[in-house]
Amino acid sequence: MKVLQEPTCVSDYMSISTCEWKMNGPTNCSTELRLLYQLVFLLSEAHTCIPENNGGAGCVCHLLMDDVVSADNYTLDLWAGQQLLWKGSFKPSEHVKPRAPGNLTVHTNVSDTLLLTWSNPYPPDNYLYNHLTYAVNIWSENDPADFRIYNVTYLEPSLRIAASTLKSGISYRARVRAWAQCYNTTWSEWSPSTKWHNSYREPFEQHHHHHHHHHHH
């Protein structure tokens, strides 16, 4: 039994780091392998992660961590019974994939304005809480070409857009993801999407000429 692709890990910079690797043949990861990990620090204990299968020869392990600071470094030992297959280390702050934002809501009760809000996925005591920026993806269910990305580079987890920038009378979906420049993170996964029906009162002169486009809230 050998490691074909060495473990690579990403951290959510809060409580979970996920490591993936490939073996040289089909493997029952949970029964045959163990990934031991230990923070390089005074009182730290070694922890054991039981991997799960991720495809025939692939394995994935979710390493649980109580907290994280920038300087953290973990030792990683991959064992098959008494045989050490691989030894390495992992610095969470250098491989961050943020948690996905949650609770995406579209508020359509503000006149002619869409307000999208979502929740920051980190608590205030986490460094990333004040360092996330976001991308909001809005698309039409009816028209695949009607697909747009809004970059939210301020800290507030919200976006205001004029309802008139979208087509009236059709359904749209939105989703949001996050990243942090400070740790040069990858993008988070997308949040679950939310759906709404876009309708707005067109300006009077348009209403006058295009009465059939008029939609009430």
Epitope: F41, V69, P124, Y127
Partner: antibody
Framework: EVQLVQSGAEVKKPGATVKISCKAS????????MHWVKQAPGKGLEWVGR????????IYASKFQGKATITADTSSNTAYMELSSLRSEDTAVYHC?????????WGQGTLVTVSS | DIVMTQTPLSLSVTPGQPASISCRSS???????????LEWYLQKPGQSPQLLIY???NRFSGVPDRFSGSGSGTDFTLKISRVEAEDVGVYYC?????????FGQGTKLEIK
Amino acid sequence: EVQLVQSGAEVKKPGATVKISCKASGFNIKDTYMHWVKQAPGKGLEWVGRIDPTNGYTIYASKFQGKATITADTSSNTAYMELSSLRSEDTAVYHCVSRRPWFAYWGQGTLVTVSS
Amino acid sequence: DIVMTQTPLSLSVTPGQPASISCRSSQSIVHSNGNTYLEWYLQKPGQSPQLLIYKVTNRFSGVPDRFSGSGSGTDFTLKISRVEAEDVGVYYCFQGSHVPYTFGQGTKLEIK
């Protein structure tokens, strides 16, 4: 041996500022969060705030926002807390504590007395 | 802010007898990572506090096994199975799950 050694007692007049220090030995403060805890005479423990020494990220209890400023110097392995606009109610022993992820190591405390 | 309420505020125990201190939080102290950072500290007279229990039930290294922690949700308990003279001092519960972190008001243990 792990130790947190704090600076000596201070006596200050109302309105003054004091800066107390906490030097760590036996470990690197970059590997922990450094916290400060207040203990007024004959009273209980009160969390003031904390710093991640590597990036300087601080958080404070709301009542100490504007009162306490926590800093760290990783080159000297020392954390600091400055208390401004001192009043009699700031008289207390202030403990520095390393947390990773619990308060395993405490400094001996620094008594700050505010008296006119 | 989460308020940590300890009962009783003082207790007097005969050596060899058990003692129990309760700590109730005003809301859940489960961290968003799923852990409950409820700790117990003992401050002996003239000393800095020392860690006894972390994450509700885990004894810190060097802490005698007569100390045990239990609880979940908002109700937590520290038990001393047989009190010894060296156990005197003030016991504090602490939550490190939500900012601002907060201590209980303390329970003073005396020996009869």
